[in-house]
Amino acid sequence: QRLPRMQEDSPLGGGSSGEDDPLGEEDLPSEEDSPREEDPPGEEDLPGEEDLPGEEDLPEVKPKSEEEGSLKLEDLPTVEAPGDPQEPQNNAHRDKEGDDQSHWRYGGDPPWPRVSPACAGRFQSPVDIRPQLAAFCPALRPLELLGFQLPPLPELRLRNNGHSVQLTLPPGLEMALGPGREYRALQLHLHWGAAGRPGSEHTVEGHRFPAEIHVVHLSTAFARVDEALGRPGGLAVLAAFLEEGPEENSAYEQLLSRLEEIAEEGSETQVPGLDISALLPSDFSRYFQYEGSLTTPPCAQGVIWTVFNQTVMLSAKQLHTLSDTLWGPGDSRLQLNFRATQPLNGRVIEASFPAGVDSSPRAAEPVQLNSCLAAGD
């Protein structure tokens, strides 16, 4: 399924999205625009992030050691020191008990820049993607994933951290954005809306999708997340939009069927390992890419975002389960956990395919307005 309601091969949101909520001026790049950490009151879309060390919880990664030799990912240090590593864990994003990172929330106080000054940076995420303005970069090759088909053991930690549902990934999941751009997956988490209200973080020509998955990766150039934060390319996130389809998605069901067990904020359960790549679109060759930030405090910049052109289909029931099962802080439902789109401020989104060439009949003479900046490095 490619992006929204378009012909088979048209780019993400290639044509008019049909939404009655066109991009506002604040979504356009402008010198004065400072990023919003939340939507203006009254807007239906709430803002937010998670608690990676920005994209939910980030971990500390160490290379395979003699002792249980695998990446050790502990929580990012945003607020507290990492918890004790157990053995070979990926603790990558390990939300500590007590979770002191949670003095931020979607909407309302405190303003995110007060939680982390980086949230007021100029190159923040998420953003609105306009395929017509994307720069076609033939040097952007298909993504390569290795080790994403996990055996059922060891089981993985699935946690409601109050901001999202997060699956901590074990060592050994390798991803390459291209030659010499190698990463290790740390965790994945989701963003969603509420009944009848979409909740993806990125948008396409102003169109917001029902939900969005983020798989967070650490560059192999860094041993720990805290070393990579804020460094260009230190972290990379693969993002895909989730849409409603006619059939149940069996890969997602392995996680969604366990959400009731972690309905309460701070609760967690263990789930059998699964094929993580099955949670992503099958087409690894068509995507958008730009440099942005974590979408939750600490909002560290330098994050390489790769947003798939193809969407993932879940049944209506599954999308309802996702948005209606978990509880967040203060007896409130965990819903609308997305941050408002942030201004590009001159950034150019690159596409691995000619996204500006809209195959729909309405695009008379499509012009690629931006040229590829990175020749593949």
């Epitope: 395979k64 249980e68 030799g69 695998s70 157990q86 053995e87 070979p88 864990q89 990926n90 603790n91 290795l146 080790g147 088909q149 055996p151 059922p152 053991l153 060891p154 089981e155 074990p170 060592p171 050994g172 390798e174 263990q270 059998p272 094929d275």
Partner: antibody
């Protein structure tokens, strides 16, 4: 020291049942997945079943699915294999093995019991 | 027929080097799953020899080493000794079978 002590093997008729036990000591039993592996006389090793540390998730080889049940009692540090509808081809030495920790299978099956012989014959 | 294929037997004289191959497919070794090696001396339980492709547990002599490439793995034994005479098994996970799998085993004879 880390060890696994097995019991429960013996001679049983085809169609019969048997329960194997594996008592663990020297490590935090509930933190590790456990596995059963068998070896028919003169043959190689065959994985039979595995169970997560909590006991919530269980896995079986196709050859025993529906007939064997793996379970554990973490309060007793003991792993079990309930074998029903036994067949002649189930005749083997059965080994229990400590496998994955709660976060990694990196170390393989690093501790094995001495094995217990199950003979299915009329 | 095992999913992981090993030679039924290998042999070598004391002091020599032998290798035992373990050939799999894209659904097991080639999918990136770790390969572990076990040694089974006559009449005893298997013992972990190499874990995660190329790591030795404490107590295993450095004469034993493992490697993995593509859809195959191999175990190398240098400075062969009489006490190395045993059966050797490789083990991994297979995503198609959704099962942990062993090679058929290789009998090492020290001449």
């Amino acid at each position: 020291q880390v060890q696994l002590v097995q019991s429960g093997g013996g001679l049983v008729q085809p169609g019969g049942s048997l329960r194997l036990s594996c008592a663990a000591s020297g490590f935090t039993f509930s933190s590790y997945a456990m596995s059963w592996v068998r070896q028919a006389p003169g043959k190689g090793l065959e994985w039979v079943s595995a169970i997560s540390g909590s006991g919530v998730s269980t896995y079986y080889a196709d050859s025993v699915k529906g007939r064997f049940t793996i379970s554990r009692d973490n309060s007793k540090n003991t792993l079990y294999l309930q074998m029903n509808s036994l067949r002649a081809e189930d005749t083997a030495v059965y080994y229990c093995a400590k496998y994955c920790s709660s976060t990694s299978c990196y170390r393989g099956m690093d501790v094995w019991g001495k094995g217990t012989l199950v003979t299915v014959s009329s | 027929q095992s999913v992981l294929t090993q030679p039924p037997s290998v042999s070598g004289a004391p002091g020599q080097r032998v290798t035992i191959s373990c050939t799999g497919s894209s659904s097991n070794i080639g999918a990136g799953y770790d390969v572990h090696w076990y040694q089974q001396l006559p009449g005893t339980a298997p013992k972990l020899l190499i874990y995660a492709n190329n790591n030795r547990p404490s107590g295993v002599p450095d004469r034993f080493s493992g490697s993995k490439s593509g859809t195959s793995a191999s175990l190398a034994i240098t400075g062969l000794q009489a006490e190395d005479e045993a059966d050797y098994y490789c083990q991994s996970y297979d995503s198609s079978l959704r099962a942990w799998v062993f090679g058929g085993g290789t009998k090492l004879a020290v001449l």
